[in-house]
């Protein structure tokens, strides 16, 4: 129950990629506004996105303080123009979000192949170490900085002229693979956190092929 002209938010959903984290919900407001609160399991509630008509709230600044914590958010509904009004229980209507642990649940963003360099019959493929919004000592940490060895990359590669795909993995952001001289190869990479139970893999990177500008060839 609540005031006659407000409805509780529903379908509260965390949308998070590389720790950029937004809480979304429904419905689109009609004569009402929302305020979001976020808390760790043991912490105090902090209000964000005050009296907004949006149905999303960027909570990145809060969750990056400790990405290994588990967070809970709640969305309060208020009548537009009368935000002091409360429900029959003496407080505004609200709905809780599912719990969210960024380190375990944030989606891995699509990686990018930074470069590849051929030297003879070997190709060194380097994956860009994407910057996140997680900070330490006033600097932004990269994905590798945050996840360490929990993060691996899988390389898919194949001859330009065939469909047979090979794979390799690495615990760094580099691969060094054997290729046939005189053949052009194409590459795609995927970020993986093997220890996870959900959101283990990113989407594949865009395909990069030898003979294009990202590559370099040396005898």
């Amino acid at each position: 129950s609540g005031t006659t002209n407000t409805v509780a938010a529903y379908n509260l959903t965390w949308k998070s990629t590389n720790f950029k984290t937004i809480l979304e919900w429904e419905p689109k407001p009609v004569n009402q506004v929302y305020t979001v609160q976020i808390s760790t399991k043991s912490g105090d509630w902090k209000s964000k996105c005050f009296y907004t008509t949006d149905t999303e709230c960027d909570l990145t600044d809060e969750i990056v303080k400790d990405v290994k914590q588990t967070y809970l958010a709640r969305v309060f509904s208020y009548p537009a123009g009368n935000v002091e009004s409360t429900g029959s229980a003496g407080e505004p209507l609200y709905e809780n979000s599912p719990e969210f642990t960024p380190y375990l649940e944030t989606n891995l963003g699509q990686p990018t192949i930074q470069s590849f360099e051929q030297v003879g019959t070997k190709v060194n493929v380097t994956v860009e170490d994407e910057r996140t919004l997680v900070r330490r000592n006033n600097t932004f940490l990269s994905l590798r900085d945050v996840f360490g060895k929990d993060l691996i990359y899988t390389l898919y590669y194949w001859k330009d002229s065939s469909t047979g795909r090979k794979t390799n993995t690495t615990h760094t952001n580099e691969f060094l693979i054997d290729v046939d001289k005189g053949e052009n190869y194409c590459f795609s990479v995927q970020a993986v956190i093997p220890s996870r139970t959900v959101n283990r893999k990113s989407t594949d990177s865009p395909v990069e092929c030898m003979g294009q500008e990202k590559g370099e060839f040396r005898e």
């Epitope: 330490r136 900085d145 360490g148 993995t169 760094t172």
Partner: antibody
Framework: QVQLQESGPGLVKPSQTLSLTCTVS?????????WSWIRQHPGKGLEWIGE???????RYNPSLKSRVTISVDTSKNQFSLKLSSVTAADTAVYYC??????????????????WGKGTTVTVSS | EIVLTQSPGTLSLSPGERATLSCRAS???????LAWYQQKPGQAPRLLIY???TRQTGIPDRFSGSGSGTDFTLTISRLEPEDFAVYYC?????????FGGGTKVEIK
């Protein structure tokens, strides 16, 4: 070449916190390796305690996780181990080690290739 | 956790003989993550083999590693006096990283 040196008290009282520091010389702690702590009980095998990256990213042995904190100080080129609520069962030689990437089969994997000499810690009242 | 069982516990051999040390895992281990270490009394362990079969720089070619899945082997083709020590296998693919209980190679 890189060398590691453990330091800290050799005697700790039961229920107190064991604190050790590993100083890295001959290389930067921020150069893409991981830094580990391993212990060896008297006359026994090796037990991995945990590791840290220069960014502060850590992994711990679940059997010790509730009592262990590993931290890094890049300005001093050091990393540290704290083990709380110690008992006689924590008496051991404690080693720090570098976990460095080695090329294998198309990718790079980490192995503990440089170790400190080890420091003996006895837990006793 | 992955349990590594080494056998035999002690191997008594003479210099010049061949030593075969076994390491069996409780579940499959990707060979990329399998290493062998040597430890002498009063010293820290030393990395010998990584990736199950690749010798670390400076390790003599009398040391060789093999195996995959759950069964791995360290072979010392001709024992030198300095090879008498304790040998540990280790997996670094799954947390917690674990070591075998060790095989002591002693002079017969």
């Amino acid at each position: 070449q890189v060398q590691l040196q453990e330091s800290g008290p050799g005697l700790v009282k039961p229920s107190q916190t064991l604190s050790l520091t590993c100083t890295v010389s001959g290389g930067s702690i921020s150069s893409g390796q991981y830094w580990s702590w391993i212990r060896q009980h008297p006359g026994k095998g090796l037990e991995w305690i945990g590791e840290i990256y220069y960014s502060g990213s850590t992994r711990y042995n679940p059997s010790l996780k509730s009592r262990v904190t590993i931290s890094v100080d890049t300005s001093k080129n050091q990393f540290s181990l704290k083990l709380s609520s110690v008992t006689a069962a924590d008496t051991a030689v404690y080693y720090c080690a570098r976990d460095a990437p080695y090329y294998y089969g198309g990718g790079y994997y980490y192995y503990m290739d440089v170790w400190g000499k080890g420091t003996t810690v006895t837990v006793s009242s | 956790e992955i349990v590594l069982t080494q056998s035999p516990g002690t191997l008594s051999l003479s210099p010049g003989e061949r030593a075969t040390l076994s390491c069996r895992a409780s579940e499959s281990v990707d060979s990329s993550y399998l290493a062998w270490y040597q430890q002498k009394p009063g010293q820290a362990p030393r990395l010998l083999i990584y990736g199950a079969s690749t010798r670390q720089t400076g390790i003599p070619d009398r040391f060789s590693g093999s195996g995959s899945g759950t069964d791995f082997t360290l072979t010392i083709s001709r024992l030198e006096p300095e090879d008498f020590a304790v040998y540990y296998c280790q997996q670094a693919g799954v947390v917690p990283y674990t070591f075998g209980g060790g095989t002591k190679v002693e002079i017969k």
